[in-house]
């Protein structure tokens, strides 16, 4: 092909020419190319008009191309380029007009390019620039040059892993002249040991990230004091998993935050084994979102009921026991992948609407009632990937629930009463792989609004699917895969007029019957793959609903013998519906094993006697 040795990803649009030992820009790529990856080629030098042949380019990746010199107008003609990646090039000579002509550039990545200063970086004319990533360089001064006043669209400035030690008032002068209140600034992994008080006074930022910046707690405290006067939508403090400098926090560690205006706060990778953390977070009582990620914490009981947090996130933290959470204003709680407390204890969250308690290995002595959560406003509840959950209440006071996920938790007492009877607003229910054995036809009674039901990996009494879906008149998606099913009631799906997707894969059906699907006028996808289907169980196979677009019968045990000729012919007649038809193979007889069913030509004659 003309573009070889490059790889054509999307014809005329996207080409990957990675690591092909090119010394110059290839000339066999179409003019119309929009995305071009030239990374890991020894280009070394970019002269003027290097990319004249690609006027439509939007994304250009020149990572690790050993580029040392970029001449004036190297990218001239790339007026549509929005992303330029120069990561890992040992640039020594960068002409003043190196980036001229890039009138649409939005993202410039110059990570690890030997950049020693922003002052001499010739990007002041890139008015469309939204994201500038100059991480992993040799920048020592945080002074934002005057030309930043031209970069009125700048939203992300990544200065992480540089050599910045001191931040002075004059460094941010340009932000006073031309406020960039949407700017997110990442200063992580700079060895900061001094921030001049007032440097951030009256400055507004969207996000400020300071992770693994401080050698010890005292430096951190004084630097936080130096942030006084900053108004920031989101502040991220802490460390990285592999970059830990700070010992245990003390209760005054975050005192300086009282002098900032913060909307959202996140703390990462720290140890807070304090007996009383209320003092630690007192200055954050009024933030709307509070997040602890990978923080070892002794007691969360000390969060005050009066804290005005609306969103609390506790992820991958370590607790001595499940925290007693009592917060008046909280609307969203994300408590996931935590270690420690293995038994849920009730929380008092009267404003709560969204609750994610997934992946904690928690056991629930009872579930679920408004008294467990202290709210009647809950709409979203995720209890997936936990331990034993005993269903002892039918969601009294939780009638507003719309989304409920139990997947991969161990549900007990599911077949003793209509657990979901009061959930008339529920739209999404996942009870996949919950050790549920359906032995009670009223299991889904009351779910009048349900659209999605996932119940894969469970089991049914006598491996028979009874009429358990009678209330689910709004169901559009049903997953019954891996349920060891062998038979189903002919009327099992009769009320599911809106059903569009039905997954019956990975069960133990030996025959296919179209009859149960006659009342599914909206059915589009039917998956019967990974069963043991040999034939149909009635002579007269009717047609599937006309709405059906995809029928998956792959990986079954088709019997390619004369007695099943009409069934095999029927399959051929459904050819336009079949998904991955080439994977539909004969299982018997042995001489036809592995042969594609659709290529069979079975001619059978009646023996005349």
């Amino acid at each position: 092909e003309s573009w070889e040795p490059c790889v054509e990803v999307v014809p005329n649009i996207t080409y990957q020419c990675m690591e092909l030992k090119f010394y110059k820009i290839p000339d066999n790529i179409p003019f119309s190319t929009k995305n071009l990856d030239l990374s890991f080629n020894p280009l070394r030098h970019l002269g003027s008009y290097s990319f004249l042949r690609f006027p439509e380019l939007q994304v250009l990746d020149l990572s690790r191309c050993e580029i040392q010199t970029i001449e004036d107008g190297a990218y001239q003609s790339l007026s549509h380029l929005s992303t330029l990646i120069l990561t890992g090039n040992p640039i020594q000579s960068l002409a003043l007009g190196a980036f001229s002509g890039l009138s649409s550039l939005q993202k410039l990545v110059a990570v690890e390019t030997n950049l020693a200063s922003l002052e001499n970086f010739p990007i002041g004319h890139l008015k469309t620039l939204k994201e500038l990533n100059v991480a992993h360089n040799l920048i020592q001064s945080f002074k934002l040059p005057e030309y930043f006043s031209n970069l009125t669209n700048l939203e992300h400035l990544d200065l992480s892993s540089n050599k910045i030690q001191n931040i002075y008032c004059k460094d941010l002068q340009v932000l006073h002249q031309m406020p960039l209140s949407n700017l997110s600034l990442d200063l992580s992994l700079n060895p900061i040991n001094f921030i001049q008080p007032g440097a951030f006074k009256e400055i507004r930022l969207h996000k400020l990230t300071l992770r693994s910046n401080f050698d010890d707690l005292n430096v951190m405290k004084t630097c936080i004091q130096g942030l006084a006067g900053l108004e920031v939508h989101r502040l991220v403090l802490g460390e990285f998993r592999n970059e830990r400098n700070l010992e245990e926090f003390d209760k005054s560690s975050l005192e300086g935050l009282c002098n900032l205006t913060i909307e959202e706060f996140r703390l990462t990778y720290l140890d807070c084994y304090l007996d009383n953390i209320i003092d630690l977070f007192n200055c954050l009582a009024n933030v709307s979102s509070f997040s602890l990620v990978s923080v070892n914490i002794k007691r969360v009981e000390d969060f005050s009921y009066n804290f005005r947090w609306q969103h609390l996130e506790l992820v991958n933290c370590k607790f001595e026991q499940f925290p007693t959470l009592e917060l008046k204003s909280l609307k969203r709680l994300t408590f996931t992948a935590n270690k420690g407390g293995n038994a849920f204890s009730e929380v008092d969250l009267p404003s709560l609407e969204f609750l994610d308690l997934s992946r904690n290995g928690l056991s629930f002595k009872g579930c679920c009632s408004q008294s467990d959560f202290g709210t009647t406003s809950l709409k979203y509840l995720d209890l997936s990937f936990n331990d034993v959950i005993t269903m002892s209440s039918n969601f009294l006071g939780l009638e507003q629930l719309e989304h409920l996920d139990f997947q991969h938790s161990n549900l007990k007492q599911m077949s003793q009463f209509s657990v979901f009877l009061s959930l008339r607003n529920l739209i999404y229910l996942d009870i996949s792989h919950t050790h549920t054995r359906v032995a009670f036809n009223g299991i889904f009674d009351g779910l009048l609004s349900l659209k999605v039901l996932k119940m894969a990996g469970n089991s049914f009494q006598e491996n028979f699917l009874p009429d358990i879906f009678t209330d689910l008149k709004n169901l559009t998606f049903l997953d019954l895969s891996q349920c060891q099913l062998e038979q189903l009631s002919p009327t099992a799906f009769d009320t599911l007029n809106k059903l569009q997707v039905l997954n019956m894969s990975h069960n133990n059906f030996f025959s296919l019957d179209t009859f149960p699907y006659k009342c599914l006028p909206s059915l589009q996808v039917l998956d019967y793959s990974l069963n043991h289907i040999m034939t149909s169980n009635n002579q007269e196979l009717q047609h599937f609903p006309s709405s059906l677009a995809f029928l998956n019968l792959t990986q079954n045990d088709f019997a390619c013998t004369c007695e099943h000729q009409s069934f095999l012919q029927w399959i051929k007649d459904q050819r336009q519906l079949l998904v991955e038809a080439e994977r539909m193979e004969c299982a018997t007889p042995s001489d036809k094993q592995g042969m594609p069913v659709l290529s069979l030509n079975i001619t059978c004659q009646m023996n005349k006697t």
Epitope: D275, D302, Y305, N306, T324, K328, K365, S393
Partner: antibody
Framework: QVQLQESGPGLVKPSDTLSLTCAVS?????????WHWIRQPPGKGLEWMGY???????DFNPSLKTRITISRDTSKNQFSLKLSSVTAVDTAVYYC???????????WGQGTLVTVSS | EIVLTQSPDFQSVTPKEKVTITCRAS??????LHWYQQKPDQSPKLLIK???HAISGVPSRFSGSGSGTDFTLTINSLEAEDAATYYC?????????FGGGTKVEIK
């Protein structure tokens, strides 16, 4: 409106078992909350004894753990307290109460006095 | 267990006077402290939850404050019907415990 009503003998002999029942109206005890026993010796303060959760789980004050049992009958919507090997110090007004999601008690029974005496 | 110490044990007050009752916890309990009023031969009645949140129906003269280990219940202008014993209760951890009570008498 939730209402709780204690009942049981007012006099129990030392070393016997004290038995009380709390009848609840206005909320099914098997559908939510935890249901507690609290006592108050004459002229003294309140002591939390233990509870039964709507799921049937129970927990007790460590000081009473060896002597106390709390059970329930959801069909009658009532829960019961048994305190074995009683002595004179167990003489008190016994209250049943419902705890809210926070650890406080908005609903109490009117209390019943149990005297331990021979 | 967390011990709650109330003071004073007894207070004799003139109507319209301001009453202040304190409750001290043996360890920090954030604001997980609740106040009850108990009149003779009646069961306790919840007045204040979480140190400062008045329960609906409770007269506005009752207020609470404090956090950590020191808490206060204030009755701004005492009325005759306020003669009762007042108890604090911590909800920070089990076993739940009550203070010893403060008896308020009308002079």
């Amino acid at each position: 409106q939730v209402q709780l009503q204690e009942s049981g003998p007012g006099l129990v002999k030392p070393s016997d078992t004290l038995s009380l029942t709390c009848a609840v109206s206005g909320f099914p005890i098997g559908q939510g909350y935890s249901w507690h026993w609290i006592r108050q010796p004459p002229g003294k303060g309140l002591e939390w004894m233990g509870y039964i959760h709507y799921s049937g789980y129970t927990d007790f004050n460590p000081s009473l753990k060896t002597r106390i049992t709390i059970s329930r009958d959801t069909s009658k919507n009532q829960f019961s307290l048994k305190l074995s090997s009683v002595t004179a110090v167990d003489t008190a007004v016994y209250y049943c109460a419902r705890k809210d999601s926070g650890n406080y008690f908005p609903y109490w029974g009117q209390g019943t006095l149990v005297t331990v005496s021979s | 267990e967390i011990v709650l110490t109330q003071s004073p044990d007894f207070q004799s007050v003139t109507p319209k006077e301001k009453v202040t009752i304190t409750c001290r916890a043996s360890q920090s309990i954030s604001d997980h402290l609740h106040w009850y009023q108990q009149k003779p031969d009646q069961s306790p009645k919840l007045l204040i939850k979480y140190a400062s949140h008045a329960i609906s129906g409770v007269p506005s003269r009752f207020s609470g404050s404090g956090s950590g280990t020191d808490f206060t219940l204030t009755i701004n202008s005492l009325e005759a019907e306020d003669a009762a014993t007042y108890y604090c209760q911590q909800g920070h951890s089990f076993p739940l415990t009550f203070g010893g009570g403060t008896k308020v008498e009308i002079k």
